[in-house]
Structures are given as C-alpha cells and as structure tokens.
C-alpha cells in the first residue's frame, strides 16, 4: 500500500539511536559512565555474619558476589539485556517518570553444597541452587 | 564432635527471622508496605511512542508491562526470590552499606510477533523473545 511504501521511505528519518535499537541490536557505544555500569561485584558472605553458624557446619561462608550499576540508555551488548529491558530503557529515556530504568540483576547463578543440621540434629549435605552470582545483566 | 553437638544445641538461640530464612523457606509475613512491594505494573507501549512506526507495520503497540517495587527483608514467597536474593536481602538488612537490596525484575517473559520492514524494505514477520513481562520477582 502507499502508506506502507511511505513508512518504508520514512525510515531514514528515524533518529539513529532508535534505529540502532532494532530490538536486540543494542548500541555498542554507551554514553553512561562505564565505571558505573551494571556489573558483578565481590561479596564474601560469612554464615556467622548471618547468624547461621549454629546450624550450618560447612562451609564457613562463600563468595556470593552481587550485581550493581546503571542500566542506562543506550545499553551495551555486554549488559546481557533482554528485549524488554531495551524497550524499558528507551521508555525511561523518553520519559523518566513513566518507568524506572531496568535493574542490574543476576543473569546466571551457581549452586553451592552446604553441610547443616536439620531440626532433628541430623547432619545433611544439600546442594542449594542459585546461591552464587556468575553474571549480571540489565532486566 | 563436641563442637558440633554444642552448635546443634545452640540452634534454638538463633533469631527467629534468620531461622525462618533457611535458604528458600522465606517468611510469609512481610513487614514492608504491601503497596510498595515488587510487582507487575501496566505499561502499554505504542511503537509510535518509541519512534519506530516507520519500520514496524504491526502491531501498533503492545502491552509490555514492567516490574517495580521494594525487595525488603523479609521477602514474601510470592516475590519469586532466588536463594541469592534471600541472602542479599539479609546482608542488606544487617548492613545496608554492604550491598543494595535485590531488585525487582522480570522472572518470566513472553514473546510477541512483529511485522516490519528490513533494510531492503522487505516485509518480515519475526517473533521477538522476552518482550512482555509475565511475572516479577526479587533478584
């Protein structure tokens, strides 16, 4: 149709930052400060600090890590953003009052094995899923 | 060992809120304001709003939804929290300077089908994954 042809021709008028954002083809050159960008940070959790030392036998603690940082427009590809996060970032960029920025959260988590006492004081070895952050991304 | 027995006997001295947090057994009675808790919110995104109307033919827009709200201690089970989020919430509760609270992010996302013009003005029908928030949780 003429409308379709018109729209097809109009595409060159679309702002570059939006054109580049064709769903998952995320702009590489982020304007947000790289030091502040969403990434994995060190965090060692001691079970004593959590007050769990009396029922967890081993380990004494573990490297849990955590995610923190900006998920600002435009998102870099290393930010493991979902298509929804890309759309939300753009909505926030257009009007920050409408939605918050996507948040920096774990995208991959690993398990740890824990030796602990159950309620009957039996010693149990159990694998706890999703305990360690392996990677972070914008969600 | 005597140490183990001692620790086993000491378990009753562990504060209730921490005992209840044995990994994924999350306390049901949240003290944080329910209205502010992490949940799914309405958000309709028109492709015109994003400036994409010249290359997206259909749909005109879609119900994207978004996640927003508090992930405060103790986490309710409906908050779909990972074990890591439970640990992070407790670390934050003990010392807010150490780590941020976990963030409210999509836990389930759905796809949508989009009819659009490619760079050669061909009409393409493509399924874009992770475009619609189906559920939110604390991560």
């Amino acid at each position: 149709s003429t409308g379709s042809k018109q729209r097809s021709q109009n595409r060159s008028k679309t702002p570059k930052n939006q054109e580049a954002l064709r769903m998952a083809n995320v702009a590489e050159n982020s304007s947000s400060d790289q030091r502040q960008a969403c990434k994995k940070h060190e965090l060692y959790v001691s079970f004593r600090d959590l007050g769990w030392q009396d029922w967890i036998i081993a380990p004494e603690g573990y490297a849990a890590y955590y995610c923190e940082g900006e998920c600002a427009f435009p998102l870099n590809s290393y930010m493991n953003a979902t298509n929804h996060a890309i759309v939300q970032t753009l909505v926030h960029f257009i009007n920050p009052e409408t939605v918050p920025k996507p948040c920096c959260a774990p995208t991959q988590l690993n398990a740890i094995s824990v030796l602990y006492f159950d309620d009957s004081s039996n010693v149990i070895l159990k694998k706890y899923r999703n305990m360690v952050v392996r990677a972070c991304g914008c969600h | 060992s005597t140490g183990s027995k001692q620790r086993s006997q000491n378990r009753s001295k562990t504060p209730k809120n921490q005992e209840a947090l044995r990994m994924a057994n999350v306390a049901e009675n949240s003290s944080s304001d329910q209205r502010q808790a992490c949940k799914k919110h309405e958000l309709y995104v028109s492709f015109r709003d994003l400036g994409w109307q010249d290359w997206i033919i259909a749909p005109e827009g879609y119900a994207a939804y978004y996640c927003e709200g508090e992930c405060a201690f103790p986490l309710n089970s409906y908050m779909n929290a990972t074990n890591h989020a439970i640990v992070q919430t407790l670390v934050h509760f003990i010392n807010p300077e150490t780590v941020p609270k976990p963030c409210c992010a999509p836990t389930q996302l759905n796809a949508i089908s989009v009819l659009y013009f490619d760079d050669s003005s061909n009409v393409i029908l493509k399924k874009y994954r992770n475009m619609v928030v189906r559920a939110c949780g604390c991560h």
């Epitope: 009052e97 409408t98 | 919110h41 309405e42 958000l43 309709y44 028109s46 709003d49 827009g61 119900a63």
Partner: nanobody
C-alpha cells in the same frame, strides 16, 4: 495515588467551543497517559483522545480535527479544547490517567468524577 478533578463543562450551542480541564493531585501526571473518554446516557464509555507519556497524541475518529489535548506539567493539568461542537458530542466527559492501552478505559487506573457537556442544536 492520583486524584483527578475535571472542570469546564456546560451548555453550548452547536458550532461553539468549550475547554475542559483535568487537574491532578497526589502525584505528577507527566509519567502517565492522560486520556479523555465520554459517556452518553445508555452508551459505553467512548475513547475521545489521549496524550501519551511520550507526548504523542492519539485521537478518536469522531473528534479528529475538532478536539485538541494539551498538558501543562507545571500546573499538573491536562486540557481538552473542543471546537466545532455537535449535538452528538453531548455526554459526561471523564479524564483518566494510566499506563495501559490508551484507547481502552480499562487501561486507566485513575479517574475524575466527570463533567457534563451539553451541545444544543
């Protein structure tokens, strides 16, 4: 919470103009879609016009070229300028704020109490 209060309704002759106002309190209006709907006796609530969070305007077919929506963020108020009014524009006009589908009243979370517009021939 957003509280909405409409004003500016009244009786006007066909071909005349009216300006409706919708003042928001409790929270800023600017992050929401601001929509005007109308309801004539015994009829469904009908979409009139919406101003998106992006600043883009969406008009219902029956009011295109006659009605204009605008927003004053400083005053936290949305206006509906109605020109070339027709008797069929007679209805209670409601202002809504939400983030759902702009043409569907179910996409709006907050509503005003409505203001009556009567167009006489």
């Amino acid at each position: 919470e957003v509280q909405l209060v409409e004003s500016g309704g009244g009786l006007v002759q066909a071909g005349g103009s009216l300006r409706l106002s919708c003042a928001a309190s409790g929270r800023t209006f600017s992050g929401y879609v601001a929509g005007w709907f109308r309801q004539a006796p015994g009829k469904e609530r009908e979409f009139v016009v919406a101003l998106s969070w992006s600043g883009i305007t969406y008009y219902g077919d029956s009011v295109k070229g006659r009605f204009t929506i605008s927003r004053d963020n400083g005053k936290n108020t949305v206006y509906l300028q109605m020109n070339s009014l027709k008797p069929e524009d007679t209805a209670v006009y409601y202002c809504g704020a939400g983030k759902g589908y702009y043409k569907d009243y179910r996409g709006y979370d907050y509503w005003g109490q409505g203001t009556q517009v009567t167009v006489s021939s």
